[in-house]
């Protein structure tokens, strides 16, 4: 057995969520590097006052630790600076961004492939530069969502060890050329750009050279601007159900939404014998309601000991600041014998009760449904 009855109305205060805390960035820095962490405001909106926290304790600004509302810099990093960093809303303590920072003895590329691309002694007396990992350079076009971290690599070798420089759109590329700067990891043959924005689009060329020759590789970066969308409901959920009198029924709705969705379970009801109000909008009662903090949510409605009055049309509705998605579904309640017969018919017909997915936009709704309180209901019964 699973859970018993749902509460009629469960409210929840809306909190503005930043980038999903689950998307924890794992970063590796070399000893002596400047650790730079960026936490842009969610959806590009105002950030509000924030606090930076390391391993659960608030960070105190100093000459070495530079704290801003969206950015944290730790200069001349050492092993002691390793740890779990987060940026939180000061008032709510809601975590906006998570970072796992590791500071190693040697400079590194800032990801899980540390050390793999370092220059190696090839044993060759002299030689022009060559690519050591050409198979890793196949992807010439990189398209990433805004606010992501981008790393371009040109792992190479030669004797003497070649130098590496970077061009953007054919011109010398330096840190001061972009807000947020860049990280050049010469030992890792890499260019790192954090929190990319549309202006970072372009062609990036690594030039690797020594006195015996020069090689180059060009990558194209496209930055995709995230366009928030109204919630999406998983097809086929919730499905229509037929239940026996006195049994328990459970419905499942799955919601996907970049922006925090307000999720509701609603039931169409009658007031004074009418299903719609004077203006033609349906009467509905809220069975359960809350704000989801995640980009995806599994929501369930459980009705215990159902009676005939629980039969009817229900809705799973998800709303964010972009729009609305909702799915209507039906519960039919019968006596034991009738229910058995209907289930047999359903099997023969091939899942008669599997409801078809229906996404309804705000415009399609034709006005808000009327929300009915328990007192407004005449002879309405809900568990």
């Amino acid at each position: 057995e699973s859970l018993g009855t749902e509460q009629r109305v469960v409210g929840r205060v809306a909190e503005v969520s930043g980038p999903e805390p689950s998307q924890q960035e794992q970063l590796v820095f070399g000893s002596g590097d400047a650790v730079e962490l960026s936490c842009p405001p969610p959806g590009g909106g105002p950030m509000g006052p924030t606090v930076w926290v390391k391993d659960g304790a608030g960070l105190v600004p100093s000459e070495r630790v530079l704290v801003g509302p969206q950015r944290l810099q730790v200069l001349n990093a050492s092993h002691e600076d390793s740890g779990a960093y987060s940026c939180r809303q000061r008032l709510t303590q809601l975590v906006l961004c998570h970072f796992s920072v590791r500071v190693t003895d040697a400079p590194s590329s800032g990801d899980d492939e540390d050390g793999e691309d370092e220059a190696e002694d090839t044993g060759v007396d002299t030689g022009a530069p060559y690519w050591t990992r050409p198979e890793r350079m196949d992807k010439k076009l990189l398209a990433v969502p805004a606010a992501n971290t981008v790393r371009f690599r040109c792992p190479a070798a030669g004797n003497p060890t070649p130098s590496i420089s970077w061009l953007k759109n054919g011109k010398e590329f330096r840190g001061e050329h972009r807000i947020g700067g860049i990280k050049l990891r010469h030992q890792q043959w890499s260019l790192v750009m954090e929190s990319v924005v549309p202006s970072d689009r372009g062609n990036y060329t690594c030039v690797v050279e020594n006195k015996f020759g020069s090689i180059r590789q060009t990558y194209t970066l496209d930055v995709l601007e995230r366009s928030p969308h109204r919630p999406i409901l998983q097809a086929g959920l919730p499905a229509n159900q037929t239940a026996v009198l006195g049994s328990d029924v459970e419905f499942h709705c799955k919601v996907y939404s970049d922006a925090q969705p307000h999720i509701q379970w609603l039931k169409h009801v009658e007031v004074n014998g009418s299903k719609v109000g004077p203006d033609g909008t349906p009467y509905v009662t809220v069975l359960k309601s809350w704000i989801s903090e995640s980009v995806e949510a599994d929501v369930r409605l459980r009705l215990a000991n159902v009676s005939e009055r629980d039969g009817g049309e229900y809705l799973c509705r998800a709303t964010n600041f972009i729009g609305v998605a909702e799915k209507a579904f039906w519960l039919s309640v019968h006596g034991p014998r009738a229910a058995e017969e209907e289930l047999v018919e359903a099997d023969e017909a091939g899942s008669v009760y599997a409801g078809e997915q229906k996404l309804i936009s705000e415009e399609d709704l034709g006005g808000e449904q009327k929300l009915i309180s328990e007192e407004d209901l005449h002879h309405h019964h809900h568990h």
């Epitope: 995640s294 995806e296 599994d298």
Partner: antibody, heavy 119, light 108 residues
Framework: EVQLVESGGGLVQPGGSLRLSCIVS????????MSWLRQAPGKGLEWISY????????YYADSVKGRFTISRDSAKNSLYLEMNSLRAEDTAIYYC????????????WGQGTLVTVSS | DIQMTQSPSSLSASVGDRVTITCRAS??????LNWYQQKPGKAPKLLIY???SLQSGVPSRFSGSGSGTDFTLTISSLQPEDFATYYC??????????FGQGTRLEIK
């Protein structure tokens, strides 16, 4: 009948690794969010990790972040917890749990598997 | 993070007694509060969810109440099998999911 059965616990030295598994039955695994919780000897309950039904959303407690990795395989009806860089304070009974829904309780628990980190 | 504080930490009572355990959240959690029972050597078991809803199969002598920050678990008439440790847990704001420190209920 809903069942969750953990395995993979044992004795490991500090700095070592272990992989816990949880095989579930009696419900549609791919429709439920799952979590790992633990309980140190004589102590209270501590939530350590969460994974959404699709596996796309993952959360960790600060105490294990960067060391533990949660994953799931719906084809095998299995939940996993990869534990690296283990410390003495990770010694505990580890429980695999089902979360009823996104704002709901842990309605079913496994029997637990003991992890001992000691030299 | 939302902190959960249970009181008392331990409690001695006799069979037939009415017992109350309280749980306080550091900020409002609406009705997103669950209660669990744990017996020695066993996994915890869900008793009450959403502050006041009785989990299927749990005896009706267990009840829960409260909303916002203050919650109560009540056992109306203590039975021998009720001697255990009880935990409250909030599921309002995640992560992290947080528990109270537990209340140990012992035989007087």
């Amino acid at each position: 009948e809903v069942q969750l059965v953990e395995s993979g616990g044992g004795l490991v030295q500090p700095g070592g690794s272990l992989r816990l598994s949880c095989i579930v039955s009696g419900f549609i695994f791919s429709s439920y969010e799952m979590s790992w919780l633990r309980q140190a000897p004589g102590k209270g309950l501590e939530w350590i990790s969460y994974i959404s039904s699709s596996g796309r959303v993952i959360y960790y407690a600060d105490s294990v972040k960067g060391r533990f990795t949660i994953s799931r395989d719906s084809a095998k009806n299995s939940l996993y917890l990869e534990m690296n860089s283990l410390r003495a304070e990770d010694t505990a009974i580890y429980y695999c749990t089902r979360k009823w829904d996104s704002s709901g309780p842990f309605d079913f628990w496994g029997q637990g598997t003991l992890v001992t980190v000691s030299s | 993070d939302i902190q959960m504080t249970q009181s008392p930490s331990s409690l001695s009572a006799s069979v037939g007694d009415r017992v109350t355990i309280t749980c306080r959240a550091s900020q409002s959690i609406s009705s997103y509060l669950n209660w669990y029972q744990q017996k020695p050597g066993k996994a915890p078991k869900l008793l009450i969810y959403a502050a006041s809803s009785l989990q299927s199969g749990v005896p009706s002598r267990f009840s829960g109440s409260g909303s916002g920050t203050d919650f109560t678990l009540t056992i109306s008439s203590l039975q021998p099998e009720d001697f255990a440790t009880y935990y409250c847990q909030q599921s309002y704001s995640t992560p992290p999911i947080t528990f109270g420190q537990g209340t140990r209920l012992e035989i007087k």
